[in-house]
C-alpha cells in the first residue's frame, strides 16, 4: 500500500539500528572513496530527518522518494567532482535517471588497499570503547569494496562479527580465539559477495525473467514438497527483493526480505518441514537461516517427468497457451527431483527443452520429434559431472595451493591478455572450489562446484568488461549466464597470443618477501607463475614445475641466509638465467 512518507514507513518497519546500517551501506556502495566520517555524518542527518517524518508524515520533504532524498544528500557533498570525476555529472539528472547513473558508476574493483585486520588487542580495545563505531567501520569497509553486497546479509555478518568480538575479547588469548572465527566469517562473506554479484549481473544483463527462472529452480530443489504455485510466489518475491537490492533500494529490499521470512514461517506447512529451527530466530538470523536451509525430503511418489512433458498428447497445446508457465512447471518438476544438479545445469536442461518444443511443435509430427528429448539431456548432464570428477581428483592429488596453480596455468593459457592480478585472483578463487566442494558427499558436489565456479567466472567477466582485452573472454562473458562455465571450460590455449618478452625485473625478488604472510607469499609466487606462462604459453607441466620448484628453493634459501639482501642480489640473476634455459 502507498505511504505518505516512504522514509518514515521504512524507519518504522526496520527500526533505528538496521535503518542506520542500511543507509550507511547504501552511501558506502555509491560513493566508495569517501571516508567513514563523511558517510556517518550523512547517515545521522538522514536518520534525524526520518525521525521528523515519523513524528509528522506531512512535514516538509517527507513525501519525497528515498532515491530523491539519498541522491540529494550525495550530490550536496563538497568537492564531489574532485573526488569522483564524471560521477558528479549524475547530479545534473532527475530521478530515476540520477539513480541509474549512480548505479552505472559503481566500481567492482575500487582502488582501495586490501582490508587489513588490526591485531587482536587493538581490535578489542576499539571494539570495547565504541562497538557501534567499530561495526559501522566494518559495514563501510566491506560495502565500499563490494558495491553489490546484499545489504541485509551484510547486516547479518556485522552481527556475527559483533558476536565473535564480544566472545573473544574477554579471553586471555584473544588472537587464538578471534583468528579462526573471523576467518570463517570473512570466507563466508567473500563467497556471499561473489554470489550476489552474479545475481545482480543476471538481473542487469538478462532481466527479471532469467532471475526468476534461477529462483524457481533453487526453491524447487529446496522445497520439493511445495506446490508449483507456492514456488512461483516465493520466486516472485525473491526476484523483487534482489531487484531492489541490486538497484540500490536497500531499505525496501531489507524490509521485503523480513516480510518474506515472516510469510515463510507462517506457511511452513505448505513450504517445507525444515523451517521451524530458523523461524525461532530474530529477524536477520531468521532470513539468513532460511536462505541457507537444507533441502526438504523429496516426496516418495513422484511420477516420471516424461508423463506430463513428453508422453502427454497435449504438450504442444499446453506450451503454446502459456509458454513461460509450462516451462516453469517443467523447471519446477525437474528441479525438485534433482537436488544433486546445479541450478546452472537445470536451467540448461530447461533451455534445451524449450528449444526442442519450439522446433518440434511447429512440425508435422511433434511427438515423434520431441519424444527423445529426455535422452538428449544426457550429454548436458555428463559434461559437468566429468568436470567435477576430474577437478576433484586433481585437487585431492595437489592440495589447494597446487590446484590453484594448475588452474592458474590453465586460465593464463586460455586468456593470456588478461592482467596478471585478475588472473591470480580468479585462479585463487576458482582453486578454492576444491576445499569448499570436493570434500562434500557425492550428491552435493555438482551443485556446489558448478554454481560456485559460475559466480567466480562472473566476477572475472565483470572485471574484464571494465577493460576488455581478450576476445575469447568477451565471447564467453557475452553469452547466456548459464553457458558461461561450459564456455570457459571449453577454451583452449590462445593460439593468437604473441608471447610476452622475458623481463628479468618481473622475476627479481628481494628480502621483503621473507616477512610476508603465507597468503601474500603465495600470491607473489603465483604472479611469477602467470608471468612465466605469458612468456611461454606452451611450456610443459614439467618445465613449469622445474622452474617453480627452483624458485621456491631460492626463496627458501635466501630467507634463511644470514645476509638475505646479498643472497637475493647474487642468487636472483642465477635463478633468472636457469629459468630462461629451462624454458628454452
Amino acid at each position: 500500500e502507498a505511504h505518505k512518507s516512504e522514509i518514515a514507513h521504512r524507519f518504522k518497519d526496520l527500526g533505528e539500528q538496521h535503518f542506520k546500517g542500511l543507509v550507511l551501506i547504501a552511501f558506502s556502495q555509491y560513493l566508495q572513496k569517501c571516508p567513514y566520517e563523511e558517510h556517518i555524518k550523512l547517515v545521522q542527518e538522514v536518520t534525524d530527518f526520518a525521525k521528523t517524518c515519523v513524528a509528522d508524515e506531512n512535514a516538509e520533504n517527507c513525501d519525497k522518494s528515498i532515491h530523491t532524498l539519498f541522491g540529494d544528500k550525495l550530490c550536496a557533498i563538497p568537492k564531489l567532482r574532485d573526488n569522483y570525476g564524471e560521477l558528479a555529472d549524475c547530479c545534473a539528472k532527475q530521478e530515476p535517471e540520477r539513480n541509474e547513473c549512480f548505479l552505472q558508476h559503481k566500481d567492482d574493483n575500487p582502488n582501495l588497499p586490501p582490508f587489513q585486520r588490526p591485531e587482536a588487542e587493538a581490535m578489542c580495545t576499539s571494539f570495547q570503547e565504541n562497538p557501534t563505531s567499530f561495526l559501522g567501520h566494518y559495514l563501510h569497509e566491506v560495502a565500499r569494496r563490494h558495491p553489490y553486497f546484499y545489504a541485509p546479509e551484510l547486516l547479518y555478518y556485522a552481527e556475527k562479527y559483533n558476536e565473535v568480538l564480544t566472545q573473544c575479547c574477554t579471553e586471555s588469548d584473544k588472537a587464538a580465539c578471534l583468528t579462526p572465527k573471523l576467518d570463517a566469517v570473512k570466507e563466508k562473506a567473500l563467497v556471499a559477495a561473489v554470489r550476489q554479484r552474479m545475481k545482480c549481473s543476471s538481473m542487469q544483463r538478462f532481466g527479471e525473467r532469467a532471475f526468476k527462472a534461477w529462483a524457481v529452480a533453487r526453491m524447487s530443489q529446496r522445497f520439493p514438497n511445495a506446490e508449483f504455485a507456492e514456488i512461483t510466489k516465493l520466486a516472485t518475491d525473491v526476484t523483487k527483493i534482489n531487484k531492489e537490492c541490486c538497484h540500490g533500494d536497500l531499505l525496501e529490499c531489507a524490509d521485503d526480505r523480513a516480510e518474506l521470512a515472516k510469510y515463510m514461517c507462517e506457511n511452513q506447512a505448505t513450504i517445507s518441514s525444515k523451517l521451524q529451527a530458523c523461524c525461532d530466530k530474530p529477524v536477520l538470523q531468521k532470513s539468513q537461516c532460511l536462505a541457507e536451509i537444507e533441502h526438504d525430503n523429496i516426496p516418495a511418489d513422484l511420477p516420471s517427468i516424461a508423463a506430463d512433458f513428453v508422453e502427454d498428447k497435449e504438450v504442444c497445446k499446453n506450451y503454446a497457451e502459456a509458454k513461460d508457465v509450462f516451462l516453469g512447471t517443467f523447471l519446477y518438476e525437474y528441479s525438485r527431483r534433482h537436488p544433486d544438479y546445479s541450478v546452472s545445469l537445470l536451467l540448461r536442461l530447461a533451455k534445451k527443452y524449450e528449444a526442442t518444443l519450439e522446433k518440434c511443435c511447429a512440425e508435422g509430427d511433434p511427438p515423434a520429434c520431441y519424444g527423445t528429448v529426455l535422452a538428449e539431456f544426457q550429454p548436458l548432464v555428463e559434461e559437468p559431472k566429468n568436470l567435477v570428477k576430474t577437478n576433484c581428483e586433481l585437487y585431492e592429488k595437489l592440495g589447494e595451493y597446487g590446484f590453484q596453480n594448475a588452474v592458474l596455468v590453465r586460465y593464463t593459457q586460455k586468456a593470456p591478455q588478461v592482467s596478471t592480478p585478475t588472473l591470480v585472483e580468479a585462479a585463487r578463487n576458482l582453486g578454492r572450489v576444491g576445499t569448499k566442494c570436493c570434500t562434500l558427499p557425492e550428491a552435493q558436489r555438482l551443485p556446489c562446484v558448478e554454481d560456485y565456479l559460475s559466480a567466480i567466472l562472473n566476477r572475472l567477466c565483470v572485471l574484464h568488461e571494465k577493460t576488455p582485452v581478450s576476445e575469447k573472454v568477451t565471447k564467453c562473458c557475452s553469452g547466456s549466464l548459464v553457458e558461461r562455465r561450459p564456455c570457459f571450460s571449453a577454451l583452449t590455449v590462445d593460439e593468437t597470443y604473441v608471447p610476452k618478452e622475458f623481463k628479468a625485473e618481473t622475476f627479481t625478488f628481494h628480502s621483503d618477501i621473507c616477512t610476508l604472510p603465507d597468503k601474500e607469499k603465495q600470491i607473489k609466487k603465483q604472479t611469477a607463475l602467470a608471468e612465466l606462462v605469458k612468456h611461454k604459453p606452451k611450456a610443459t607441466e614439467d618445465q613449469l614445475k622445474t622452474v617453480m620448484g627452483d624458485f621456491a628453493q631460492f626463496v627458501d634459501k635466501c630467507c634463511k641466509a644470514a645476509d638475505k639482501d646479498n643472497c637475493f642480489a647474487t642468487e636472483g640473476p642465477n635463478l633468472v638465467a636457469r629459468s630462461k634455459e629451462a624454458l628454452a
Epitope: 504455485a229 497435449e314 504442444c316 497445446k317 499446453n318 506450451y319 503454446a320 497457451e321 502459456a322 509458454k323 508457465v325 509450462f326 512447471t329 519450439e358 511443435c361 511447429a362
Partner: nanobody, 123 residues
Framework: QVQLQESGGGLVQPGGSLRLSCAAS????????MVWVRQATGKGLEWVST????????RYADSVNGRFTISRDNAENTLYLLMNSLKPEDTAVYYC????????????????RGQGTQVTVSS
Amino acid sequence: QVQLQESGGGLVQPGGSLRLSCAASGFAFSTSGMVWVRQATGKGLEWVSTISDDSRIIRYADSVNGRFTISRDNAENTLYLLMNSLKPEDTAVYYCATYRAGSRIGSYEDYYRGQGTQVTVSS
C-alpha cells in the same frame, strides 16, 4: 485490465463459413498464447483451437481439424477463427480466451474470456 471482445457470429447454413474476430486489450497480446473455446447449450466448455504468441505453433481439436483456421495479427491485437464447412454440431457460443496467472493450463473456466459470440448452424 484484460479485455476480450468477440464478434462475427451469426446464423449460417450447414456447409457455410464465418470469420470470428477477437479484439484484445489490457495485456501483452503479442507475447501471449491465445485460445478459442466454445459452449453448446447445456454443455461444458470445449476447446477448439490454440495459437502461440508468434503463430508458429497451432493446434486444433479433432472435431474441427481441416475445417477451421486460427490466426492472429499482433500489430492489431486481434485473434481470428475462420470456420468453413460448418455443421449443426458447431452451434455454440464461441469465446476467445487467454491464460490467467495462477490457473492450471487447459483449465479454460479459469482463463480470461470475452462475452462470447453466438454461432448457429441451421437450415
